[in-house]
């Protein structure tokens, strides 16, 4: 025998109090799959959360965070404070990155500057709290007498003007 509740579509529930009739989900509730015996309560985006997507009869509300915060956890279950670039969030608030580290985002941790010498390269642009160093050519490429980084222009034959 087929379960009569299996015919109830998403957005409804199988109402045992009414001979297993498919009843619409009440306000502020939803069912995202068919055959449900209850509807789930919609998530409410309160306080530091704001509504990204309203609840419907077939899908839950989705929240994100108010400006100055960013989402953490599955389905944005938490909002964490933003910091400025060049800082990281510690257990005592936002702190500047230590010398030799950087953070180019408003979230996450300070990361060490790239060590150019590990790749046999030189530092082209120094790092800051907000930006990583930029590695350039290897020191050998910059030493006197080394071949030029750009190839020389081709020689023109005498007596010929450029086209």
């Amino acid at each position: 025998l087929q379960d009569p509740c299996s015919n109830c579509p998403a957005g409804t529930f199988c109402d045992n109090n009414r001979n297993q009739i498919c009843s619409p989900c009440p306000p502020n509730s939803f069912s995202s799959a068919g055959g449900q015996r209850t509807c789930d309560i919609c998530r409410q985006c309160k306080g530091v959360f704001r509504t990204r997507k309203e609840c419907s009869s077939t899908s839950n509300a989705e929240c994100d965070c108010t400006p100055g915060f960013h989402c953490l956890g599955a389905g944005c279950s938490m909002c964490e404070q933003d910091c400025k670039q060049g800082q990281e969030l510690t257990k005592k608030g936002c702190k500047d990155c230590c010398f030799g580290t950087f953070n180019d985002q408003k979230r996450g941790i300070c990361r060490p500057w790239t060590n150019c010498s590990l790749d046999g390269k030189s530092v082209l642009v120094n790092g800051t709290k907000e930006r990583d160093v930029v590695c350039g050519p290897s020191p050998a490429d910059l030493s006197p007498g080394a071949s030029s980084v750009t190839p020389p222009a081709p020689a023109r034959e005498p007596g010929h003007s450029p086209q």
Partner: nanobody, 124 residues
Amino acid sequence: EVQLLESGGGLVQPGGSLRLSCAASGFTFSNYAMSWFRQPPETGLKWVSSIDGSGGDTYYADSVKGRFTISRDNSKNTLYLQMNSLRAEDTAVYYCAKEGSHGTDDSHYDVDVWGQGTTVTVSS
């Protein structure tokens, strides 16, 4: 799969006590520092307390020092937060978290796994 499951939240009167638990699975529990965080209704996530892998070192936010006690039972893979002298401002969703490194007062939030949270409401 690494999982954290909190329990023990509920409604309590000001001055009352609650004990939160966090059951861990999927990793070698004793190898990692663990933390409690909370998110009050109107503000962002705040660190509450941390404990190192052995349970020897504990750290607390100033707002809970002397009232909350973090502990762990490595034989049961469980983290605890004993909360005494509760105040209205302790109302929040409480999350346990696995830290990627040793947690100290001003270390960054080096958290790689969060629980789903348990709600604590302090009201008369």
